[in-house]
């Protein structure tokens, strides 16, 4: 059994979240995750879900009674979602910590917007990928 | 030229973000995007970046002088990042709008935590995928 399971059960007790009535009015995350099978779509959704949990855990960081549980779960998220890749986790954290009301940040975000947009479509990812698509189209056209 | 380019230039003027000094102290997003080539890693990062822009645009939603630019860019993000898939965009918006301080939301999140964690690793995505991996391992072992 993964270490997070026991600690998540501990959090359930703490938050009084074991009762069936907690599930009233639908789910937060599970229903949405069920909608998306494609790996890249799932990553889009899971990215928001993981950042939600990190924010939630930050809220309770001074709470000694659940400190160990929170740390264990965060560590396990790190293994599962970031493949224990510290750089990936750090970049992610950086992105979640930018403030939308800081004028310096606002300006930088707008300054970078055109380039960010150009990279949003999977096709735009790399020149290499674009080239291979062109070749593929060319091949199809000549068949 | 994509419609967002002209509108992004308009935003640059509004935010006074065209000057080269805006780029001082590194980039917000571009440097991070450069670090990740793998599509699923890029989606993890882009998910946070897109939600940042949506929050930023929300902050300026009543601002008449940039209303049209913001709407055009949001629409173009919708096309590029969500493939014009309304359901995908709606699910994403839902996730970004959950409040980490709402007790009901906290409880639901903790209630769903074990199942969310179980789905975080790509390998855990579907039973089908797990099975095919087991078969593959079995094949390799018997070679």
């Amino acid at each position: 059994q993964d270490p997070y399971v026991k600690e998540a059960e501990n959090l359930k007790k703490y938050f009084n979240a074991g009762h069936s009535d907690v599930a009233d009015n639908g789910t937060l995350f599970l229903g949405i995750l069920k909608n998306w099978k494609e790996e890249s779509d799932r990553k889009i959704m899971q990215s928001q879900i993981v950042s939600f949990y990190f924010k939630l855990f930050k809220n309770f960081k001074d709470d000694q009674s659940i400190q160990k549980s929170v740390e264990t779960i965060k560590e396990d998220m790190n293994v599962k979602f970031f493949n224990s890749n510290k750089k990936k986790r750090d970049d992610f954290e950086k992105l979640t910590n930018y403030s939308v009301t800081d004028l310096n940040v606002q300006r930088k975000a707008i300054h970078e917007l055109i380039q960010v947009m150009a990279e949003l479509s999977p096709a735009a990812k790399t020149g290499k990928r674009k080239r291979s698509q062109m070749l593929f189209r060319g091949r199809r056209a000549s068949q | 030229q994509d419609p967002y380019v002209k509108e992004a230039e308009n935003l640059k003027k509004y935010f006074n973000a065209g000057h080269s000094d805006v780029a001082d102290n590194g980039t917000l997003f571009l440097g991070i995007l450069k670090n990740w080539k793998e599509e699923s890693d890029r989606k993890i990062m882009q998910s946070q970046i897109v939600s940042f822009y949506f929050k930023l645009f929300k902050n300026f939603k009543d601002d008449q002088s940039i209303q049209k630019s913001v709407e055009t860019i949001k629409e173009d993000m919708n096309v590029k990042f969500f493939n014009s898939n309304k359901k995908k965009r709606d699910d994403f918006e839902k996730l970004t709008n959950y409040s980490v301080t709402d007790l009901n939301v906290q409880r639901k999140a903790i209630h769903e935590l074990i199942q969310v964690m179980a789905e975080l690793s790509p390998a855990a995505k579907t039973g089908k995928r797990k099975r095919s991996q087991m078969l593959f391992r079995g094949r390799r072992a018997s070679q």
Epitope: - | F60, D62, S65
Partner: nanobody, 124 residues
């Protein structure tokens, strides 16, 4: 002509809070964005925060973001600057300002109208 009356300054301990007010009268103030600037002794006047009269489009200087909150009350034609977790380096004269609404500027030379200023002193 627009008149701006700022008030609410005072002396407070580090970690404390103050709320500054800026009451506007005269010409339609809604044509402008509202900003707060501050000037510490021997320093240049610097941008603190900006907001539109609609209550949207908030921007803050990096040094105060997360501690200060700017808001508007249209009925009273007043803009507020709520300052929390004050630090000694926040000590300055704070000025309310009418700014262009079609660009976000931190340049005090582009301000149309100024309030008379209110002193904020944060002691350690």
């Amino acid at each position: 002509q627009v008149q701006l009356q700022d008030s609410g300054g005072g002396t407070v301990q580090a970690g404390g809070s103050l709320r500054l007010s800026c009451a506007a009268s005269g010409r339609t103030f809604s044509d402008y964005a509202v900003g707060w600037f501050r000037q510490a002794p021997g320093k240049e006047r610097e941008f603190v925060a900006r907001i539109l009269w609609t209550g949207a489009s908030r921007s803050y200087a990096n040094s105060v973001d997360g501690r200060f909150t700017v808001s508007t009350d249209n009925a009273k034609n007043t803009v507020y600057l709520q300052m929390n977790s004050l630090k000694p380096e926040d000590t300055a004269i704070y000025y309310c300002a009418a700014l262009p609404s079609n660009i976000i500027t931190t340049d005090y030379l582009r301000v149309y109208y100024w309030g008379q200023g209110t002193q904020v002193t944060v002691s350690s």
